[in-house]
Amino acid sequence: FERTRSLQDPCSNCPAGTFCDNNRNQICSPCPPNSFSSAGGQRTCDICRQCKGVFRTRKECSSTSNAECDCTPGFHCLGAGCSMCEQDCKQGQELTKKGCKDCCFGTFNDQKRGICRPWTNCSLDGKSVLVNGTKERDVVCGPSPADLSPGASSVTPPAPAREPGHSPQ
């Protein structure tokens, strides 16, 4: 079948990195500079993606594959294939239309991206606040107030933490 198709369509013989040039009797011509074809049998080459401004080049364009971009420092990728770059903020901030703004009291963000989230409400779990929250960190909940009352039995220390993926010996 491949052989038959080749006889019918000379373009099917053109490999990736070339295009079937109608202006030259359907000869396979190499893709011009700054263009590529990632599959065989193409009648045109695609323009390479340009990584400029907010984007920077992660992988150069070749005759057979498109360029790949990531974001210039200070910004991070969004979308499939890093289709957009969005501004980083500091921990304790969130990005708004007006740029990076500090988290409101009672909220925190421990990353350079994303939104400020409310501190955990320890009392919902019957616990008390062990460490106060900040703009950058959530509160740390401790034992319930009843556990800390005089005469109460001592708090059982937590079991030693295990590394993720490791089963107990």
Epitope: L78, G79, S83, M84, K97
Partner: nanobody, 123 residues
């Protein structure tokens, strides 16, 4: 092909003014939020200002508020940045950048930007 081309950069003394322009082509300019971002020598990229599709909302990074003015002319497919009271710390390459689909709603990502124009503030 979607294209943004900045112009208007140059050498200016502290306290001076410059007006940057950005010519847009290959897309419906009036449908998009637009931004100016800058990169100072040896530093990361910094967002400077943005403007809504119809020009009704404009926002600025604190360090340029009151000194820089962003504007647009949808009939001319052009974005502008009027820079007054320039300081040495404004020295940077300035880029115009298009806000991606959904900008201001679900994200603040930019999907196209130009080659940049260089602004040098020095005496």
């Amino acid at each position: 092909q979607v294209q943004l081309v900045e112009s208007g950069g140059g050498l200016v003394q502290p306290g001076g003014s410059l007006r940057l322009s950005c010519a847009a082509s290959g897309f419906t300019f009036s449908n998009y939020w637009m931004n100016w971002v800058r990169q100072a020598p040896g530093k990361g990229l910094e967002w400077v200002a943005n403007i809504k599709q119809d020009g009704s909302e404009k926002y600025y990074v604190d360090s340029v508020e009151g000194r820089f003015t962003i504007s647009r002319d949808n009939a001319k497919n052009s974005l502008y940045l009027q820079m007054d009271s320039l300081r040495a710390e404004d020295t940077a390459v300035y880029y115009c950048a298009r806000g991606g689909e959904g900008y201001g709603e679900s994200h603040y990502g930019m999907d196209v930007s130009g080659q940049g124009t260089t602004v040098t503030v020095s005496s």
